[in-house]
């Protein structure tokens, strides 16, 4: 069976084809080759000699037991080599020779017992080394690591490392500029020698499900003393063994580390006193809790010095009391409990993501809700009922506003967005908004993107509601049950580039409303009921138009509409997916492609 | 279409068939077997994925006695610092995991429950596997 040509001459997918040897019928120009799940078993030297341009090679689960000297010799452009799930028993010293551009080596689940004997010391370009799910017992980083000056990611998770000694990391002292992220999760650790991490600098350290008791966790974290780490991730996994006990003593050792960003990811334990628990983390710049349960929500008004707070997939009794003077970014998403939003006091806040919480807002939105006048980004999408009771007074700095899939109330009672002269992006898609007031978008003089799909209009008619949106470049009006539009609806949108009118109920096409759209490049009218043109004579669309989508409409392929069908043929160079433009009537022509139709009509006198 | 039996409990019998062409082997054990009146137990899965499990989610299509419920999307792996350790599993890596579950207080009516589980993962998104579970529910007298 042949390989699948994904990108001609470049990418070939040869997965699970029962190949016992490397195929010789692929072009020399192949750059990406997936040979996974084939029983190759043995790689002799120069195995890939006929792929001189190769950049990505996937050999996952190829039952490879032996890799000879120079197996990849000649692959001087290879950047990624994946060996996941091969039961390697014999790895020659020169197995990886010739890989002068290799940046990513994945040797997950390959029976690797030690880094010491892994022959990769010459791979100077290596950025990512993944040796997770192996049998490595010692964390001693071999001397050859001093050659790997570009290494950024080292994944040693799911190995058998129990102890870390001072001598294990000696090589890192010789590499002070290293920007290394290290994952040691799922190693059964019970001892870290104090001083092992002294004066070591890491970009990221991840330790999840490493400790089988509170005491072990406590002493191991104390063993990290002296470490300078940009981002520290601690926690557990839901499907692994969890700590039976967790209290403030667990994290006391963090006072002896220099940490820029901290994240606690999943803990099967109720956090009650977070002030004491995170006492050593009051001055990290970014603090993050993922999938934890928090009992006392008042604690978030303590004087923490965080600039970014992230609470994701957590459980709360009620919406937390947030009073944080220095906080600039708050991400509070996919949380449970506390369904009603209550005011927060965050005077420095610039970025606020409150999406996917099922929250309801009794009144939205003004400075008093968020305690800030600096807000630039606000995401309230995928929430409950949001009642618009104020038009963003004190929030004039907003540039990005997202309400999609929340239920907006009172949107047509006043000019909700009147204050937002700096707003660039607005999404009110699927918000149950019924447009019944022409001033709905007044004030949005800087707006560039407006998404309002899945809403409705009074009498299914699009009125002149965009008159002030002179900078708009993207407008989505799909799924709005529209049947008609004002001929001047788009007259002020001279910068508009993309207009989506798909999935509405238009029965005819008219070019007149688009005559002022001098920048229009994409017009999507798919999934309507267009049978014919509104006027007998259709003008041309703006000359800037490059893509016109008229697929899945109800074209009437009869003599009566001959001029419209001819007009469509004249637009051929603009049309996309023409094979999906089919006749709906008459029945004998149903399903026929409109463009292949040859209608010759005689005028009956 | 070959049917794979999972287990029997006092009020339910559970089996599955593949609903994709590939039919990559997957081993599923539930211990103790699910009882629909209330249940607590362990789900054990052994599987070698044909693509990375990063950003794994399930589309669930549930049918109760021929009545179709709306499609549900269950996100399992968000993409970074996920709840489950198997979210970091790579294509070709053995996934051998045990997940605890519990539910109570749901009354199910007698009949045949079908649940099509479409597992989607990776970037770009592609189907990982598709299984159709059949649960025959026979509420016992008490």
């Amino acid at each position: 069976e042949p390989c699948v040509e994904v990108v001609p001459n470049i990418t070939y997918q040869c997965m699970e084809l029962n190949f016992y040897k490397i195929p010789d019928n692929l072009p020399f120009s192949t750059k990406n080759l997936d040979l996974s799940f084939n029983p190759l078993r043995h790689l002799g030297s120069y195995s890939f000699f006929s792929f001189p341009e190769l950049q990505v090679l996937d050999l996952s689960r190829c039952e490879i037991q032996t890799i000879e000297d120079g197996a990849y010799q000649s692959l001087s452009h290879l950047s990624t080599l994946i060996l996941t799930g091969n039961p390697i028993q014999s790895l020659a010293l020169g197995a990886f020779s010739g890989l002068s551009s290799l940046q990513k080596l994945v040797a997950v689940e390959t029976n690797l017992a030690s880094l010491e004997n892994f022959p990769i010391g010459h791979l100077k370009t290596l950025k990512e080394l993944n040796v997770a799910h192996n049998l490595i017992q010692s964390f001693k980083l071999p001397e050859y690591f001093s050659n790997l000056t570009n290494l950024e990611h080292l994944d040693l998770s799911s190995n058998k490392i129990q102890s870390i000694y001072c001598t294990d990391l000696r090589v890192l002292h010789q590499m002070p500029l290293l920007n290394l992220s290290l994952d040691l999760s799922l190693n059964p650790m019970n001892f870290i020698q104090p001083g092992a991490f002294k004066e070591i600098r890491l970009h990221k350290l991840t330790l999840r499900n490493n400790f089988d008791s509170l005491n072990v966790m406590k002493t191991c974290i104390q063993g990290l003393a002296g470490l300078e780490v940009h981002r520290l991730v601690l926690g557990e996994f839901r499907n692994e063994g969890n700590l039976e006990k967790f209290d403030k003593s667990a994290l006391e050792g963090l006072c002896n580390l220099t940490i820029e960003e901290f994240r606690l990811a999943y803990l099967d334990y109720y956090l009650d006193d977070i002030i004491d628990l995170f006492n050593c983390l009051t001055n990290v710049s970014s603090f993050s809790l993922v999938s934890v349960t928090i009992e006392r929500v008042k604690d978030f008004s303590y004087n923490f010095g965080w600039q970014h707070l992230e609470l994701v997939n957590c459980k709360f009794g009620q919406f937390p009391t947030l009073k944080l003077k220095s906080l600039k970014r708050l991400t509070f998403t996919s949380n449970k409990g506390g369904n009603a939003f209550s005011e927060v006091d965050l005077p420095s806040l610039e970025f606020l993501d409150l999406s996917r919480n099922g929250l309801s807002f009794k009144g939205c939105c003004s400075q008093s809700d968020f305690g800030t006048t600096s807000l630039k980004y606000l995401d309230l999408s995928f929430n409950g009922v949001i009642t618009m009771s104020s038009n963003f007074l004190g929030l004039e700095q907003l540039e990005h506003l997202d309400f999609q899939h929340s239920n907006l109330k009172q949107m047509s009672e006043f000019s909700v967005f009147l204050s937002l002269r700096n707003l660039i992006y607005l999404d009110i898609s699927h918000t149950h908004t019924r447009v019944a007031f022409n001033g709905i978008f007044n004030g949005l003089s800087s707006l560039e993107v407006l998404k309002m799909a899945g809403n409705s209009f009074q009498e299914n008619f699009l009125p002149d509601i965009f008159t002030e949106l002179r900078n708009l470049t993207f407008l989505d009006l799909s799924q709005c049950q529209l049947e008609q539009l004002s001929p001047t609806a788009f007259n002020s949108l001279s910068s508009l580039q993309v207009l989506n009118m798909s999935h509405n109920n238009f029965f005819s096409l008219d070019t007149f409303p688009y005559k002022c759209l001098n920048s229009l490049q994409v017009l999507d009218y798919s999934l309507n009921h267009i049978m014919t043109s509104k006027k007998q004579e259709l003008q041309h669309f703006p000359s800037s138009l490059a893509f016109l989508n008229l697929t899945q409409n109800d074209f009437a392929c009869t003599c009566e509409h001959q001029s419209f069908l001819q007009w469509i043929k004249d637009q051929r160079q603009l049309l996309v997916e023409v094979e999906r433009m089919e006749c709906a009537t008459p029945s004998d022509k149903q399903g026929m492609p409109v463009l292949s139709l040859n209608i010759t009509c005689q005028m009956n006198k | 279409q070959k049917q794979y039996w999972v287990c029997n409990s006092s009020d339910a019998s559970i089996s599955y068939t593949y609903c994709d062409k590939m039919q990559y082997p997957i081993s599923i054990n539930v211990n103790p077997c699910i009882e629909l009146k209330r249940s607590k137990g362990l789900l054990h899965i052994f599987y070698i994925p044909r693509r990375d499990l990063k950003q794994l989610y399930f589309n669930l299509y549930i049918t109760v006695n021929t009545m179709n419920l709306p499609k549900r999307k269950e996100v399992i792996c968000r993409g970074s610092d996920d709840d489950y350790s198997f979210c970091r599993a790579l294509k070709g890596e053995t996934v051998n995991t045990t997940i605890s579950f519990s539910f109570k207080g749901i009354k199910f009516s007698k009949g045949k429950y079908k649940c099509v589980v479409e597992a989607i993962s990776g970037s770009p998104e592609e189907m990982l596997f598709c299984l159709e579970f059949v649960i025959l529910h026979q509420p016992n007298s008490n």
Epitope: D24, L43, S45, F49 | -
Partner: nanobody
Framework: EVQLVESGGGLVQAGESLRLSCVAS????????MGWYRQAPGKQGESVAI???????YYPDSVKGRFGISRDNAKNTVYLQMNSLKVEDTGVYYC??????RGQGTQVTVSS
């Protein structure tokens, strides 16, 4: 056991030609991918010519139009014709049989 023996190397002036030969023993080359790989001191090795069993050939841009590879399956031999040699063509030239190995190499030196 597969053995590959190269010959034909030597010292030439820039602009001159050389023809390298490689005789294989222990296996028939007719179904094998064959080629030449060169290694210059202090430089990254590179494949300079490849020929598949169907006769299709590959040359990198650095030698395209100057080098030509051919095979004689009856003689179990592969040839590399090198014309308009440049100083940067200097190095050890190895005969390769994909997946099976290489010969001991033959030195080619091009002087200015």
């Amino acid at each position: 056991e597969v053995q590959l023996v190269e010959s034909g190397g030597g010292l030439v002036q820039a602009g001159e030609s050389l023809r390298l030969s490689c005789v294989a023993s222990g296996i028939s080359i007719s179904t094998e991918i064959m080629g030449w790989y060169r290694q210059a001191p202090g430089k990254q090795g590179e494949s300079v010519a490849i020929v598949k069993s169907d006769g299709s050939t590959y040359y990198p841009d650095s030698v395209k139009g100057r080098f030509g590879i051919s095979r004689d399956n009856a003689k179990n031999t592969v040839y590399l014709q090198m014309n308009s040699l440049k100083v940067e063509d200097t190095g050890v030239y190895y005969c390769i049989m994909a997946g099976r190995g290489r010969g001991q190499g033959t030195q080619v030196t091009v002087s200015s």
